[in-house]
């Protein structure tokens, strides 16, 4: 079997260890006898058999340390894990998630009070007591709060006509309150009577365009923790009640609002004061804030827009969408069902991703089934425990900084596991921690450039021109991202990631992200392009390789030769083609146009004798077989049968 340790010509201890978890480096002074290259790097057993003493071998091992003292978590254990990794190695540990029997519940109603919601808001007057009784079996400690939203109070979202600016719904013959971005009306309270009074006092408002400013309001409700009164220990439910879609980031450019949403709380006297100066949040930003603040969202949607919200669910973890009946009759049922579903689902997400560290998480559900961690387990009861098998891998050793941490967070839980990553990338012989030994293979040293003395080497800079470090004479040295050493670029180490290439022109942080992970966590970034691990493909490694087979038509062609396969779906590159396999292209067949008269001859049914005669004379030389496949489509194509 190939021994990559010995065959890769590793010139230094660090390079050797980076080759793979099986490689070791011998620091013994008198180890190299014949001067053959890279004898110091080999499999540990080989080094020993070649005469290297065990205590002279640099071979950092993988450690998983789980401190048992000071464990404060009750639902997610262990709360902290320390992992020592070396290149190519992986470490394993088990994470337990144990839902509590009963959680306090904070339920905040965020209600679209635009005019079309008139009937639904009336129902809110009576939800409190009924809901508290229905939720009593799930939680003893139940609080309700309330806030209202409409949209950004600028044109073209609201009417700025003087007669309508204060009453947007004169069309409905209603006396409306002025439009607003978001108003926090009632902080979370266990006093149901107070909640019902606040809802009873709520007046309808209005605006012009169909989408509302729901995501603006949601973000504020999520991040303004002290205003809303969210409790640390509670399950936090944000019920968004609406009958329309929501504006997304960039929509507000239409009103000249171009400052990106900063994701912070901007409530002054319970009113969102940045509504008219800051953009709507993006879905990614909203998702991040909801997860960070342990908010589970229930979209309670009436009417046709229910599916718009349902389609968002994969992008907003810990979110549920339910359809409300007319006058919101089933609103409480929706809350109870959603809560029952939320507390019976346990899934995790990796946050604070560490550059170059890869997590593979498998949930082991109470029924014994195994699921990917992001999918997690369903039908989990409070007596159950969900186990997550976590595998942490470090592919390479090219990231600066020795110690880092990631966070594994069960969605909707207020506890996390902090995973400290220690990269064993350097050798003891390099930093005087251990006995002084050979950290560089002397057979590699270029005497013209390296001047070595007692295992310390320095460079003789003057002998080399910096021109060899430029991709073009007009370009900066090493693309401005490195220094020229011995005529070669040594690229800067930066926090964003790795800069590399002959002229430091490449990097590994400008690749596309998918669900917050670089290359979806299924590949490595090289020169701005995702290089996918085996079994994954797509521009961001987001697609399982098997997905490609869904793009092959009955003739074995990928997307009929008119498109590319993206995650098992054809994206037609020819704008004229449509269909699952881009198979329909009414205007593609120039062969049909050019030879239309002769095409008839291939399907001679119901042709007059005159035309049949013409077929024999004018079209006799036509290579009919060549067109058969295409013509069958010509004749089935509506555009040719008109």
């Amino acid at each position: 079997e190939d021994n990559r340790c010995a065959s890769s010509n590793a010139a230094s201890c660090a390079r050797c260890l980076a080759l793979g978890p099986e490689c070791g480096w011998c620091v013994q002074e008198d180890f190299i006898s014949g001067g053959s290259r890279s004898e110091r790097c080999d499999i540990v057993s080989n080094l020993i058999s070649k005469g290297c003493s065990v205590d002279s071998i640099e071979y950092p091992s993988v450690h998983v340390i789980i401190p048992t003292e000071n464990e404060i978590n009750t639902q997610v254990t262990p709360g902290e894990v320390s992992i020592q990794l070396r290149p190519g190695a992986e470490a394993n540990f088990m994470l337990k998630v144990h839902p509590l029997k009963k959680y306090p519940v904070d339920l905040y109603y965020l209600v679209d009070v635009s005019a079309s919601m008139h009937n639904n808001i009336e129902k809110l007057n009576s939800v409190g007591n009924d809901l508290s009784r229905k939720m009593a079996f799930f939680s003893r400690d139940f609080r309700l709060g309330f806030g209202s939203y409409v949209d950004k109070t600028v044109s073209p979202y609201i009417s700025i006509h003087p007669e309508r600016i204060h009453n947007q719904c004169s069309d409905y013959n209603l006396d409306c309150m002025p439009p607003h971005g978001y108003i926090h009306v009632l902080s979370l309270t266990e006093n149901i009577t107070e909640f019902e009074k606040a809802v009873h006092r709520q007046k309808i408002s209005g605006n012009i365009d169909t989408p509302e400013g729901g995501f603006d309001a949601m973000l504020q409700a999520a991040v303004c923790e002290s205003h809303i009164g969210w409790r640390k220990e509670a399950k936090r439910l944000l019920l968004v009640m609406t009958d329309q879609t929501s504006h997304l980031a960039l929509d507000s450019k239409l009103a000249g609002i171009v400052v990106p949403n900063d994701g912070n709380c901007h409530l002054k006297n319970n009113v969102y004061v940045k509504s008219t100066t800051m953009e709507h949040p993006s879905l990614g930003q909203l998702s991040e804030k909801l997860i960070d603040n342990n908010i589970n969202v229930i979209f309670a949607v009436q009417g046709k827009q229910f599916h718009w919200y349902k389609d968002l669910l994969p992008l907003l973890p810990g979110t549920i969408a339910g359809e409300i009946e007319s006058k919101a009759a089933n609103l409480n049922n929706l809350v109870v069902e959603a809560y029952q579903k939320l507390i019976s689902e346990v899934k995790v997400q990796v946050e604070n991703q560490v550059q170059g560290i890869y997590f593979n998480i498998t949930a082991i559900c109470p029924d014994g089934s195994r699921k990917p961690g992001m999918e997690g387990c369903r039908n989990v009861t409070s007596n159950d425990e969900v186990l997550f098998n976590v595998t942490v891998t470090m592919k390479k050793c090219d990231v600066t900084g020795g110690k880092n941490y990631a966070i594994i967070k069960p969605i909707g839980f207020n506890e996390t596991a902090k995973i400290h990553i220690h990269r064993n990338c350097s050798c003891q012989c390099e930093d005087n921690r251990g006995p002084k030994g050979k950290c560089v293979d002397e057979t590699f040293l270029d005497s013209k450039c390296f001047q070595c003395d007692e295992n310390k080497c320095h460079f003789d800079e003057d002998q080399f021109s910096s021109e060899s470090c430029k991709s073009h004479k007009d370009q900066p040295v090493c693309s401005g991202r490195g220094v020229c050493v011995c005529g070669k670029c040594s690229c800067h180490k930066i926090k964003l990631g790795k800069v590399y290439g002959k002229y430091c022109e490449k990097d590994d942080f400008s690749c596309p992200y998918h669900h917050g992970n670089l290359c979806a966590g299924h590949g490595e970034c090289e020169a701005g392009r995702c290089q996918c691990f085996s079994g994954w493909e797509g521009d961001r490694c987001q697609c399982p390789s098997a997905a490609a087979q869904h793009c092959v038509n009955s003739k074995g062609q990928v997307c009929s030769g008119r498109g590319t396969c993206v995650c098992g779906r054809c994206e037609c590159t020819d704008p004229r083609s449509i269909g699952r396999f881009c198979e329909h292209c009414p205007t593609c067949y120039t062969a049909c146009k050019e030879n239309w008269n002769c095409m008839q001859c291939l399907h001679p049914h119901n042709l007059s004798q005159a035309i049949l005669d013409q077929c024999k004379t004018s079209c006799a030389l036509m290579e009919q077989q060549h067109y058969v496949d295409q013509t069958s489509e010509c004749f089935s194509s509506p555009s040719y049968l008109r």
Partner: antibody, heavy 115, light 107 residues
Framework: EVQLQQSGPELMKTGASVKISCKAT?????TYWIEWVKQRPGHGLEW???????????NYNEKFKGRATITADRPSNTSYMQLSSLTYGDSAVFYC????????WDHGTSVTVSS | DIEMTQSPSSLSASLGDRVTISCSTS??????LNWYQQKPDGTVTLLIY???NLHSGVPSRFSGSGSGTDYSLAISNLEPEDIATYYC?????????FGGGTKLEIK
């Protein structure tokens, strides 16, 4: 631990009123709904009504409306159920119970109505 | 009011048996259905809430299922202490209503 203690058995005349008490301990009295249920000998259970002491909200079964009055006295952590215009059909065991995930039913108060 | 129909009204089974009691409602109660056990001495305990959730401290031999208007309580591996009358109760709409009860006896 949730505990409820009801008042003792009652022997009443037809047309009179009876007031049964139910003292709660082991939890925050104002936050739990208290249910009242009637069971005639050899019969099933019949819901009379309930109250949430914290808000004063009370709901009744239409069948008992006007005759049953459910109240709660927060200082003494006690709920009361008064039933007026008693008839022979009111000879029954009356239960008070907490509502929710730590539901607890007391052993009941026996009321006998005679002439 | 929502009417609750329990069946059978009584049943006799042997120790170790599995028994099922049904409860039918006159309209959809959206799983807002509880099962109670009343022992011969009058003691009432909650067994199942929200149609299928086992109440704390109740043996796992008891299980509830159903949706819409049809619900059931199953007791597996019958034990002597299961001799009791079992009631279903809906709490979807006021007034809350109980089923007529099912008296379980041991053969």
């Amino acid at each position: 631990e949730v505990q409820l203690q009801q008042s003792g058995p009652e022997l009443m005349k037809t047309g009179a009123s009876v007031k049964i008490s139910c003292k709660a301990t082991g939890y925050t009295f104002s936050t739990y709904w208290i249910e009242w249920v009637k069971q005639r000998p050899g019969h099933g259970l019949e819901w009379i009504g309930h109250t949430l002491p914290g808000s004063g909200t009370t709901n009744y079964n239409e069948k008992f409306k006007g005759r049953a009055t459910i109240t709660a006295d927060r200082p003494s952590n006690t709920s009361y159920m008064q039933l007026s215009s008693l008839t022979y059909g009111d000879s029954a065991v009356f239960y008070c119970a907490t509502w929710g995930w730590d539901t607890y039913w007391d052993h009941g108060t026996s009321v006998t109505v005679s002439s | 009011d929502i009417e609750m129909t329990q069946s059978p009204s009584s049943l006799s089974a042997s120790l170790g048996d599995r028994v099922t009691i049904s409860c039918s409602t006159s309209q959809d109660v959206s799983s807002y259905l509880n099962w109670y056990q009343q022992k011969p001495d009058g003691t009432v305990t909650l067994l199942i809430y929200y149609a299928s959730n086992l109440h704390s401290g109740v043996p796992s031999r008891f299980s509830g299922s159903g949706s819409g208007t049809d619900y059931s309580l199953a007791i597996s591996n019958l034990e002597p202490e299961d001799i009791a009358t079992y009631y279903c109760q809906q709490y979807s709409n006021l007034p809350y209503t109980f089923g007529g009860g099912t008296k379980l006896e041991i053969k």
